[in-house]
């Protein structure tokens, strides 16, 4: 699902207040709900009728440094016999997420938000009949 | 997929540098790749064999203010005849994401990262035989 454009109003002080100096804001250290964890049913990526693989991307100047991307294994979906049925389609489920980008020059360190598209998994859909007859 | 614990080392300056004052850091205004958009196949939430509904949660002191949560519609999956097949299971796909929490007292505004669990969609899986026979 998509993150709306910021318009930067969210990060501005009220109009009656002095403006933010140097185009930056104060970000408190620490992460709220840091211990909260994804809890998904076991091995759904291989048990799904639209199975997927995971690829880990790593960037030490990004938080989180590890971003996991899913790739659907098949064009079609897996039927009860374990065979691919190409009358159905495996499609990716995408999510926009925020990460933090670290920029440093010597001892001067600043951070900036970055939007990343993550493919989280796949689902099996009935095809839309369109120009491909 | 899960965001690893920060250990706060990501946000610290190198050891040879003076520490961050007052437990806060400089966050630059603006979002990298802000115009990047999710491009998912149309209406997958209703065409999926494990369909879902969306619920929008809204918080003006969070960026993004709008967070969309998916809710699977069925226990089982929808078969080729459009009927629910409870020999298969609809299960949610979750993702950890970061949002920014705004805290203000008068003209003093600060921001903090917050981890949020988002259910992005649902997928159809073959059941593991356990307590639900």
């Amino acid at each position: 699902r998509k993150i709306p454009k910021v318009g930067h109003t969210f990060f501005q002080k009220p109009e009656s207040c002095p403006p933010v100096p140097g185009g930056s804001m104060k970000l408190d250290i620490g992460i709220i709900n840091e211990n909260q964890r994804v809890s998904m049913s076991r091995n759904i990526e291989s048990r799904s009728t639209s199975p997927w693989n995971y690829t880990v991307t790593w960037d030490p100047n990004r938080y989180p440094s590890e971003v996991v991307q899913a790739q659907c294994r098949n064009l079609g979906c897996i039927n009860a016999q374990g065979k691919e049925d190409i009358s159905m389609n495996s499609v990716p489920i995408q999510q926009e997420t925020l990460v933090v980008r670290r920029k440093h020059q010597g001892c001067s360190v600043s951070f900036q938000l970055e939007k990343v598209l993550v493919t989280v998994g796949c689902t099996c859909v009935t095809p839309v009949i369109h120009h491909v007859q | 997929r899960k965001i690893p614990k920060v250990g706060h080392t990501f946000f610290q300056k190198p050891e040879s540098c003076p520490p961050v004052p007052g437990g806060s850091m400089k966050l630059d205004i603006g979002i990298i790749n802000e115009n990047q958009r999710v491009s998912m196949s149309r209406n997958i939430e209703s065409r999926s064999t494990s369909p879902w509904n969306y619920t929008v949660t809204w918080d003006p002191n969070r960026y993004p203010s709008e967070v969309v949560q998916a809710q699977c519609r069925n226990l089982g999956c929808i078969n080729a005849q459009g009927k629910e097949d409870i020999s298969m299971n609809s299960v949610p796909i979750q993702q950890e994401t970061l949002v920014v929490r705004r805290k203000h007292q008068g003209c003093s505004v600060s921001f903090q990262l917050e981890k949020v669990l988002v259910t992005v969609g649902c997928t159809c899986v073959t059941p593991v035989i356990h307590h639900v026979q």
């Epitope: 049913s41 | 809710q71 226990l75 629910e84 299971n89 609809s90 949610p92 259910t119």
Partner: nanobody, 123 residues
Framework: QVQLVESGGGLVQAGGSLRLSCAAS????????MGWFRQAPGKEREFVAA????????KYADSVKDRFTMSRDNAKKQVYLEMNSLKPEDTAVYYC????????????????WGQGIQVTVSS
């Protein structure tokens, strides 16, 4: 924090009926299924029935099929278990719970349970 409050249990003769209620609060926005479970003395807790909040679709354990009916009231965030033709082997403490992965949920996925409600069926 999820809170679950079960009510409606009691003592009933074999062949009789009872209706259990469960009020759930603090559920996640994405919560999609609720279940009834039971634990008889000296036995493991077992699945009884499940329902989808959205579709109202249900699934039952073979031992209660055609005798028990699960329903829900979305506005009140309550689920119910109508129990007919009760047998002595239905005697147990009955619990309701959110099913975070629907029918894919395992007993060891649960972190918390309500107090439960005693149902005793005498012969």
């Amino acid at each position: 924090q999820v809170q679950l409050v079960e009510s409606g249990g009691g003592l009933v003769q074999a062949g009789g009926s009872l209706r259990l209620s469960c009020a759930a609060s603090g559920l996640a926005v994405s919560s999609y299924a609720m279940g009834w479970f039971r634990q008889a003395p000296g036995k493991e807790r077992e699945f009884v029935a499940a329902i989808s909040w959205i579709s109202g679709g249900t699934k039952y354990a073979d031992s209660v099929k055609d005798r028990f009916t699960m329903s829900r009231d979305n506005a009140k965030k309550q689920v119910y278990l109508e129990m007919n033709s009760l047998k002595p082997e239905d005697t147990a403490v009955y619990y309701c719970n959110d099913m975070p992965y629907g029918l894919d949920t395992r007993m060891d996925d649960y972190k918390y349970w309500g107090q439960g409600i005693q149902v005793t069926v005498s012969s």
